[in-house]
């Protein structure tokens, strides 16, 4: 349905309210470093002018699409060359480059400060205007995740208000708001990486590899739901993320509210675990369907052999529809496994028709393809058995060391890698092990590689900006339903040369033993990794002695009366007895 | 009891278009999907296409897909074929089909329980 003016239909549907946020935070991913106030100037132009085609859709320049609005109002911006350098570039551009070259500007690692909770400051802005301070959640997240899927920042918003109302009248602001504040930090890195990985999917495989991802995930969560029914909220679910990749908010979040309707409007034959969902307002709707636990599965479901190994016709179906054979193939498998992860599931879809391709050519089809379940036996064997042996490893030695073993792991296999990468990578790699390992033997393998998806994709959407390792692209860019196998079976780098030695990488100061202690172990950690680029032949032992004293030296400078002095003095001693051991 | 009637066919030049119609009697129920078959002289049933009753969702063989359209009216209880560029290889009998679609399987015949009677469609070059 074409409207005259698509920026008024799209500030009717959505309300001022959401049309505000939505647009302050495209604004903010596109602009990462301009400050808050010229943001809020940009979107109130815009707002106004939105109310202006509202009321009168034949107004003047209402007709223009919202990339030639949009983009016209970033590049009236004085600062654009001054603060952004060649994105200023973008401007002299026609769309729909414009908005294209806009968006290869986005910066996954903007260079920006870490947000620490100030209870008393934010509860008094809180409470002296709460839509400003909202407006800058928006912002500071937006700038920080230029990825962040718009109307589910909308959502966490609520959620960042309900913490304060709740807490900024209470006695002890702090205990009250620092632990919510904690978990809607996490929520939100969660949400983030989910949303790149989709994005990331896009740029890299294309709108196809995004589909069968959501194919296999739907099918999981709604068993019930049949092909036709799957296929059609995939559809709609794939433009709604395509859309929001692009910056495309509005329409995105329209779509996506449109999308949370229909599901609830059949709910009865997708799925029983949405009524909770669909009785709440939109934003916390939309959440929770997204959410939702997978259903249970239906008793009735036969085996899948005489359809997709004992039926002659096999090839005649395969060779008819490729698509639609493979996609229910994909959607029955995916529906029975809620225990499988989606990229193991993909990668059986893919056995399945690498089998088919070589069966239908030869002269007995029905012989060599009967056998084709036994063919996915290794592809399930292998991560379960990986991810025991790291729940094992995490059960035994605990978070902090478990993250170490990953880092060491992860240096090991791509030592070319910044420090801060490898840190960053490897705590959230052994993070999974917190998430995940703590579950039942049957949502372990699901957990550990849906959550390792995003953590390697963040690998490579950092290693894509400054690309240093060969092996690191060709697992990123080869096949999203390969990647973790491909990273799991990088070993040492045999052609990396040694970083050398310099003593200042391991020199500590008394400023360590301030720091929290999240912050006391990345400093560790980046010692660990720095280590390992150092020798990286080192044995676990030599690694664990070496990280072990230098744990035991911060401890005991931390509680020395003159701490700087004991750092100064015992500091080189250190580095020396370290060197030793792994020499 | 499903019945279903057929119209539309015929005679038609090379890059031509025609538009075959299935129309739906009897106990009609929800979750339903209504496939499109072809058979050539001396061939087997070939699937061309699915249309979901529920949600309007289209699957298309890869033969006929970017040059055939399925749609449906509610109302009416009838489903529609649009044939474009047609090319001598789609000459055939034409038929449409009902079943549940909880099956998945749309490209299978068997697992269709109601029948049109078909309709045939030439191609001449």
């Known amino acids: 349905d074409t409207h005259k003016s698509e920026i008024a239909h799209r500030f009717n549907d959505l309300g001022e309210k959401h049309f505000k946020g939505l647009v302050l935070v495209a604004f903010s991913q596109y602009l990462q470093q301009c400050p808050f106030e010229d943001h809020v100037k940009l979107v109130n132009e815009v707002t106004e002018f939105a109310k202006k085609c509202a009321a009168d859709e034949s107004a003047e320049n209402c007709d223009k699409s919202l990339h030639t609005l949009f983009g016209d109002k970033l590049c009236t911006v004085a600062t654009l060359r001054a603060t952004y350098g060649e994105l200023a570039d973008c401007c002299e551009k026609q769309e729909p480059e414009r908005n294209e070259c806009f968006l290869t500007h986005k910066d996954d690692h903007p260079n920006l400060p870490k947000l620490k909770p100030e209870p008393d400051a934010q509860c008094a802005a809180f409470q002296e205007d709460p839509d400003k301070f909202l407006g800058k959640y928006l912002y500071e997240v937006a700038r920080r995740h230029p990825y962040f899927y718009g109307p589910e920042l909308l959502f966490h918003a609520e959620e960042y208000k309900a913490d304060f109302t709740e807490c900024c009248p209470a006695d002890d602001k702090l205990a009250c708001l620092i632990p919510k504040l904690d978990a809607l930090k996490e929520r939100i890195l969660l949400s983030s990486a989910k949303e790149r990985l989709k994005c990331s999917s896009f740029q890299n495989f294309g709108e196809r590899a995004v589909k069968a991802w959501s194919v296999a995930r739907l099918s999981q969560k709604f068993p019930k739901a049949d092909f036709a029914e799957v296929s059609k909220i995939v559809t709609d679910l794939t433009k709604v993320h395509k859309e929001c990749c692009h910056g495309d908010l509005l329409e995105c979040a329209d779509d996506r509210a449109d999308l949370a309707k229909y599901i609830c409007e059949h709910q009865d034959s997708i799925s029983g675990k949405l009524k909770a969902c669909c009785d709440k307002p939109l934003l916390q709707k939309s959440h929770c369907i997204a959410e939702v636990k997978e259903d249970d599965l239906p008793s009735d479901l036969p085996a899948l052999a005489a359809d997709f190994a004992e039926d002659k016709e096999i090839c005649k179906h395969y060779k008819d529809a490729k698509d639609v054979f493979l996609g229910t193939f994909l959607y029955e498998y995916s529906r029975r496994h809620p225990d499988y992860s989606v990229s193991l599931l993909l990668r059986i879809a893919k056995t399945y028709e690498a089998t088919l391709e070589k069966c239908c050519a030869e002269a007995d089809p029905p012989a060599c393809y009967r056998t084709v379940f036994d063919q996915f036996t290794p592809l399930v064997e292998e991560p379960k058995s990986l991810v025991k042996k790291n729940c094992d490893l995490f059960e035994e030695v605990g978070e902090y060391d478990f993250q170490n073993a990953l880092i060491v792991r992860y240096t090991k296999k791509a030592p070319q890698v910044s420090t801060p990468t490898l840190v960053e990578i490897g705590r959230t790699l052994g993070k999974v092990g917190s998430r995940c390992c703590k579950l039942p033997e049957s949502e372990r393998l699901p957990c550990s590689e849906n959550h390792l998806a995003l953590a390697l994709n963040r690998l490579c959407v950092l290693h894509e900006k400054t690309p240093v390792s060969e092996k690191i692209t060709k697992c990123c860019t080869d096949s999203l339903a390969e990647r973790r196998p491909c990273f799991s079976a990088l070993e040492l780098d045999e052609g990396y040369v040694p970083k050398e030695f310099k003593a200042e990488t391991f020199t500590f100061h008394a400023d360590i033993c301030t720091l929290p202690e999240d912050e006391k172990q990345i400093k560790k950690q980046s010692a660990l990794a720095e280590l390992v680029k150092h020798k990286p032949k080192a044995t676990k032992e030599q690694l664990k002695t070496v990280l072990g004293n230098f744990s035991a030296f911060v401890a005991k400078c931390c509680g020395r009366e003159d701490k700087e002095a004991c750092f100064a003095e015992e500091g080189p001693k250190l580095v020396a007895s370290s060197q030793l051991a792994l020499a | 009891q499903v019945q279903l009637q057929q119209s539309g066919g015929g005679l038609v030049q090379a890059g031509g278009s025609l538009r075959l119609s299935c129309a739906a009697s009897?106990?009609?129920?929800?979750?339903?999907?209504m496939g499109w078959f072809r058979q050539a002289p001396g061939k087997d049933r070939e699937f061309v296409g699915v249309?979901?009753?529920?949600?309007?969702?289209?699957f298309y063989s890869d033969s006929v897909k970017g040059r055939f359209t399925m749609s449906r009216e509610i109302a009416k209880k009838t489903v529609h074929l649009q044939m474009n560029s047609l090319k001598p290889e789609d000459t055939a009998v034409y038929y449409c089909a009902a079943g549940n679609a909880l099956h998945s399987r749309y490209y299978s015949p068997s697992k269709y329980d109601y029948w049109g009677p078909g309709t045939q469609v030439t191609v001449s070059s």
């Open positions: 249309i979901s009753w529920d949600n309007g969702v289209t």
């Open positions: 009897g106990r009609f129920f929800s979750r339903q999907v």
